[in-house]
């Protein structure tokens, strides 16, 4: 009889993570007696996969009834593949003997290579605000795909990105591996409802990508512009003196009136009205009483935005003037504003 | 049903011979290592042969040269040609099947008995 | 040859005890041992297998452990029908040889 011979027809098999993988093995003899063992890998370090003589292999299960003996077909599958399993997978052939069996042929080794989908992108911004005309950074991570191929893009509001940077891990082979890419992006007064996109496309996801998403409105932070007006009233010796607060983002916003220089009031930004490009304004008035000031009233409207150095802008009320020949009714967008009286 | 079933056995004088027959059925005997062992009665059991897949034979030093292990595939069976027969070859003749990877017995049969007599 | 020794020769116990029986070779034999259980007239019954593997159809009453020289076979709970005697034999290498076997009787 001829002497035995392991053969794996298979060099290598493919399978996708999650599913079951078919290692198929046979020899061409009944003879040396011994054990079939299943090994990843070769040399000392290999790895015991399934061993016909002993042990507990709860994810491997036989192709064939190994309780023929004239079964010659040694083939295995091997449960829920994850990238982890990928390797070469050796099926070996022993001696009985002792004091331990003796490898006597092995198969030339099936490489198994697992096909895992990358993890859903996610897409994080700058940890702090900035504001327009600054460019910032956005980075977008995916995780545990196999093979190592990926295609990686970035979008703003559908239009495709190219100041952007992109890394695979680790170089070499690998079980599996993760990408990071960092975009920039210029930020402009009009990104309140933008968008930044990362699209992943891989060979596992059938040309569906998966994509991340992140929204620049917890990124983008626009300074209000600010306008003091001076507005007649019907009552002879009062002036109505707004502050219109325009374009602003996010609603955080802290308003003080000084008088000559002295606190007033401060009042916090509440019914604020949402512009289309999601911006906010806000307006805020102070009724003042000509007739209890002898000489010119600086008024100044003082702004907090967000936790930022406060702006203001400052107006003159001439106390000889006529109130109802100053500035012009430009009060249409207050919505119930506090008004204060000076005496 | 996996069985063995010896026959074969019986009275023989000293220095003569005996033909002991096991007709294997349930599975293919040329797929299996089959031996022999014997039983002395009260005595414990002695492996006295056997055979491999591919032929090779094997024996306990006591019957070299006197016994011969042997098989007919198309009948499914297993024999032993026993020669110049002594007393101390007296004894129940199991037929044995080797077991799938490992040759441990696994299947026995209902034995056979030899007695060597004058 | 491997020379097999089991002990004790023999054995009394109860019903429902545990009882462990020990067998050695005189070389390393790896785990390639073999238990069998033999009623007097009748064929032997295999048991276990590579030392501690279970036949088909045995019941887990029966273990067995060991490697290399010293092996046990282990009866967790008597019963009546497991009153025979028992023999290891290794099967390493030829010839295959048994040990001189272990009588269990009833106390």
């Known amino acids: 009889e001829e002497e035995l011979q392991v053969i794996q027809p298979d060099k290598s098999v493919l399978v996708a993570a999650g599913e079951t993988a078919t290692l198929r093995c046979t020899a061409t003899s009944l003879i040396p007696v011994g054990p079939i063992q299943w090994f990843r890998g070769a040399g000392p370090g290999r790895e015991l996969i399934y061993n016909q003589k002993e042990g507990h292999f709860p994810r491997v299960t036989t192709v064939s009834d190994l309780t023929k003996r004239e079964n010659m077909d040694f083939s295995i599958r091997i449960g829920n593949i994850t990238p982890a399993d990928a390797g070469t997978y050796y099926c070996v052939k022993f001696r009985k003997g002792s004091p331990d069996d003796v490898e006597f042929k092995s198969g030339a080794g099936t490489e198994l290579s697992v096909r895992a989908k990358p993890s859903a992108p996610v897409v994080s911004g700058p940890a702090a605000r900035a504001t327009p005309q600054h460019t910032v950074s956005f980075t977008c991570e995916s995780h545990g795909f196999s093979p190592r191929d990926i295609t990686l893009k970035w979008f703003k509001n559908g239009n495709e990105l190219s100041d952007f940077q992109t890394n695979v891990d680790p170089v070499g082979e690998s079980v599996s591996y993760s990408i990071h890419s960092t975009a920039k992006v210029v930020l402009t007064r009009e990104d309140v409802h933008s968008q930044v996109i990362c699209e992943v496309a891989h060979v596992t996801l059938q040309g569906d990508p998966l994509r991340g998403t992140a929204n620049l409105s917890e990124t983008i932070r626009v300074p209000p512009t600010l306008e003091v007006t001076q507005q007649p009233v019907r009552a002879e010796n009062q002036v109505n003196v707004t502050c219109q607060v325009r374009k602003f983002y996010p609603q955080r916003l802290q308003l003080t009136w000084l008088e000559n220089g002295n606190v007033s009031r401060t009042e916090t930004a509440s019914t604020v009205t949402e512009n289309k490009d999601g911006t906010y304004n806000w307006m805020s008035w102070l009724l003042v009483n000509v007739s209890a000031h002898r000489d010119d009233v600086k008024l100044t409207c003082q702004v907090e935005h967000d936790g930022q150095p406060a702006v203001s802008k400052s107006h003159d009320l001439k106390v000889s003037a006529h109130p109802k020949e100053q500035g012009s009714n430009t009060a249409a967008e207050n919505t119930g504003s506090n008004e204060r009286n000076i005496y | 049903e996996v069985q063995l079933v010896e026959s074969g056995g019986g009275l023989v004088q000293p220095g003569g011979s005996l033909r002991l027959s096991c007709a294997a059925s349930?599975?293919?005997?040329?797929?299996?290592?089959m031996h022999w062992v014997r039983q002395a009665t009260g005595k414990g059991l002695e492996w006295v042969s056997a055979?491999?897949?591919?032929?090779?034979?094997y024996y306990t030093g006591s019957v070299k040269g006197r016994f011969t292990i042997s098989r007919e595939n198309a009948k499914n069976s297993l024999y032993l040609q026993m020669n110049s027969l002594r007393a101390a070859d007296t004894a129940v003749y199991y037929c044995?099947?080797?077991?799938?990877?490992?040759?441990?017995?696994?299947?026995w049969g209902q034995g056979t008995m030899v007695t060597v007599s004058s | 040859d491997i020379q097999m020794t089991q002990s004790p020769s023999s054995l009394s116990a109860s019903v429902g005890d545990r009882v462990t029986i020990t067998c050695r070779a005189s070389?390393?034999?790896?785990?390639?041992l073999a238990w069998f259980q033999q009623k007097p007239g009748k064929a032997p019954k295999s048991l276990i297998y590579t030392a501690s593997s279970l036949h088909s159809g045995v019941p887990s009453k029966f273990s067995g452990s060991g490697s290399g020289t010293d092996f046990t076979l282990t009866i967790s709970s008597l019963q009546p029908e497991d009153f025979a005697t028992y023999y290891c034999?290794?099967?390493?290498?030829?010839?295959?040889?048994f040990g001189q076997g272990t009588k269990l009787e009833i106390k």
């Open positions: 044995v099947r080797g077991g799938v990877w490992d040759d441990a017995f696994d299947i």
């Open positions: 034999q290794q099967y390493v290498s030829y010839p295959y040889t």
């Open positions: 349930g599975f293919t005997l040329s797929s299996y290592d």
């Open positions: 055979i491999g897949t591919a032929g090779d034979t």
């Open positions: 070389q390393d034999i790896n785990n390639y």
